[in-house]
């Protein structure tokens, strides 16, 4: 019992403070209407006014609306926090051509390097693909844009890189009605960059689904667009994304234009038999019985096996603190919590390896 530990109930009789068991210290009690900016505020400046959901407290102490990433060419990079706006960026496969505060006003699709060129720098959310001429060492398969989606490994071309600039959009001059033909041969496989749909007076929709620029004869700038629920694989083929429709699976990452959907076992289950981008067989997460102990192994990949505990040991299947509460820093998805009375398991990440501590408790290997 530490000598410097304050008197729990009253924090030495100071009504403006309270004792937080989780951090074992006295914390400043924020006045009514103000909320702590941290778990255990120490002074009045650690308290702030609470804004409405989707608002943040700006530098001038004003509640300001967080930007929204609801446009379909945007994804959330950082969430709306009490003191900072949500930050949006262009979704995978696109880059920002016109930036905006905490967001992007206009996203364009990454260019595909034309024939005779290879990718020097792949496109990011901020920058378009940078192409450079293929060096003599590049395989002949790179003679056409279809076969030259990625640079050949091992080749380091010396030529000066050529950034591919975004297509000049004509969409802003289009009438509100009619998209497909007025956008003169709107490419049936994504071209680089549709203009922002809002500029043609329509509600925002996925740029990949709205009229786009022409795909000129002989151009290498038209990215092949697969059907919904298909993705462009490394060989340039449209391949069906895996389905997570089985009851014991949940979607881990969505089906994107260039990557499959990935599935994982739902909370409370673990993968017994893995499969590409999914799990072929999920099993309920093992419960420690009184006379069994889980044998350490890679739980995410293999069937769980049980063996008798060493003589004289009693496995403890309740790794929670004595008061039955989880430590404040730990959430149920980060630690294995077993209710020893009800013998129920709480969710843990199905991909996390599980090991055993010296006491026989299952612990999460943070990797």
């Amino acid at each position: 019992f530490p000598q410097d530990r304050p008197f729990e109930d009253t924090c030495h009789g100071n009504p403006s403070h309270y004792y937080d068991k989780a951090v074992r210290r006295c914390c400043y009690r924020c006045p009514m209407g103000l909320f702590p900016t941290q778990q255990c505020p120490q002074r009045p400046t650690d308290c702030r006014k609470q804004c409405e959901p989707d608002y943040y407290l700006d530098e001038a102490d004003r509640c300001t609306a967080c930007v929204t990433c609801s446009r379909d060419d945007l994804v959330e990079k950082t969430p709306c926090a009490w003191n900072s706006s949500r930050v949006c960026e262009c979704r995978p496969g696109m880059f920002c051509s016109t930036s905006a505060v905490n967001s992007c006003a206009r996203c364009f699709f990454h260019s595909v390097c034309p024939a005779g060129m290879i990718v020097k720098f792949p496109g990011t959310a901020q920058k378009n693909t940078v192409c450079e001429p293929a060096s003599p060492g590049v395989s002949p398969a790179c003679a056409s844009p279809e076969n030259c989606k990625e640079p050949s490994s091992g080749t380091i071309p010396q030529a000066k890189p050529t950034p591919v600039s975004p297509a000049t959009s004509s969409a802003s001059t289009m009438p509100v009605r009619g998209g497909t033909r007025l956008a003169q041969e709107a490419a049936s496989k994504l071209t680089r960059a549709p203009d922002s749909p809002s500029s043609v007076g329509r509600p925002s929709s996925d740029p990949g689904l709205s009229p786009t620029q022409p795909c000129p004869e002989g151009s290498g700038d038209c990215r092949k667009q697969c059907e919904p629920d298909y993705y462009l694989d490394e060989a340039g083929r449209c391949t069906a994304c895996v389905s997570c429709s089985r009851d014991d699976l949940v979607e881990k990452t969505p089906c994107a234009w260039n990557s499959s959907r990935t599935c994982e076992c739902r909370p409370g289950m673990i993968c017994a038999t893995s499969a590409t981008n999914s799990c072929a067989r999920c099993v309920p997460y093992p419960i420690c019985a009184a006379e069994t102990v889980t044998k350490p192994q890679d739980m995410a990949e293999k069937d769980t096996t049980f063996e008798a505990p060493p003589l004289g040991t009693q496995p403890d299947c309740n790794p929670t603190p004595e008061n039955g509460e989880a430590p404040a820093s730990t959430s149920p998805t980060q630690s294995l919590l077993v209710d020893s009375q009800a013998s129920k398991t709480l969710p843990i990440p199905t991909s996390a390896p599980v090991a055993l501590s010296s006491t026989g408790k299952p612990v999460l290997d943070a990797g």
Epitope: P145, N147, A187, P211, C215, Q225, Y230
Partner: antibody
Framework: EVQLVQSGAEVKKPGSSVKVSCKAS????????MNWVKQAPGQGLEWIGQ????????NYNGKFKGRVTLTADKSSSTAYMELSSLRSEDTAVYFC????????????WGQGTLVTVSS | EIVLTQSPDSLAVSLGERATINCRAS??????????MLWYQQKPGQPPKLLIY???NVESGVPDRFSGSGSGTDFSLTISSLEPEDIAMYFC?????????FGGGTKVEIK
């Protein structure tokens, strides 16, 4: 001007094969999916599949898979649909249609090719 | 596969009157904030002609009297004031899942 011109009508015996062509002009043939659609006499429309001429990638309707082969010749900007093991229910008009970008609609269609399967 | 149920099978409307055709999908056609529902018009001896894409966007060159609405699983095509040249078969199509499928068609005729 975008145009899709299909080959002429065919009369075939059951068990044989037919190959319908669709010549494209007025656009970058390699960069658009070419779809094929069946319409039996007095009936509705049935999607057969599609091909991306740029690399020969295909999607098929499972109902036709195994009997239908979609190919494309970039040099002549021509797409082909070959249907094998013909039976009487294959009698229909077959359309080729270009799929536009993004919204997956078919904006330009060929005039159609009537294939009659009769013994 | 996604089944599209189109109704009615046929529709007799007076010239100048409104005609509405419905199309119900067996599952949602939503995709990145839009619905992958298309509408085509087909006249005898001709290939289908694209009218509406993404459920409600009117293709260029298509008269203003045609409009599309709906989301999720329920969609409709409306001809606000029927003209003689609108006499045709109308088909809905979904592109949400492979294989793409069509509705059975609705025949629009003059009453």
């Amino acid at each position: 001007e975008v145009q899709l011109v299909q080959s002429g009508a065919e009369v075939k015996k059951p068990g044989s094969s037919v190959k319908v062509s669709c010549k494209a002009s007025g656009y970058a043939f390699s960069s658009y999916w070419m779809n094929w659609v069946k319409q039996a006499p007095g009936q509705g429309l049935e999607w057969i599949g599609q091909i991306y001429p740029g690399d020969g990638d295909t999607n098929y309707n499972g109902k036709f898979k195994g009997r239908v082969t979609l190919t494309a010749d970039k040099s002549s900007s021509t797409a082909y649909m070959e249907l094998s093991s013909l039976r009487s229910e294959d009698t229909a008009v077959y359309f080729c249609a270009r799929r536009i970008n993004g919204n997956f609609a078919m904006d330009y269609w060929g005039q159609g090719t009537l294939v009659t399967v009769s013994s | 596969e996604i089944v599209l149920t189109q109704s009615p099978d046929s529709l007799a409307v007076s010239l100048g009157e409104r005609a509405t055709i419905n199309c119900r999908a067996s599952e949602s056609l939503e995709y990145y904030g839009t619905s992958l529902m298309l509408w085509y018009q087909q006249k005898p001896g001709q290939p289908p002609k694209l009218l509406i894409y993404s459920a409600s966007n009117v293709e260029s060159g298509v008269p203003d009297r045609f409009s599309g609405s709906g989301s999720g699983t329920d969609f409709s095509l409306t001809i606000s004031s029927l003209e003689p040249e609108d006499i045709a078969m109308y088909f809905c199509q979904q592109r949400r899942k492979v294989p793409s499928t069509f509705g059975g068609g609705t025949k629009v005729e003059i009453k």
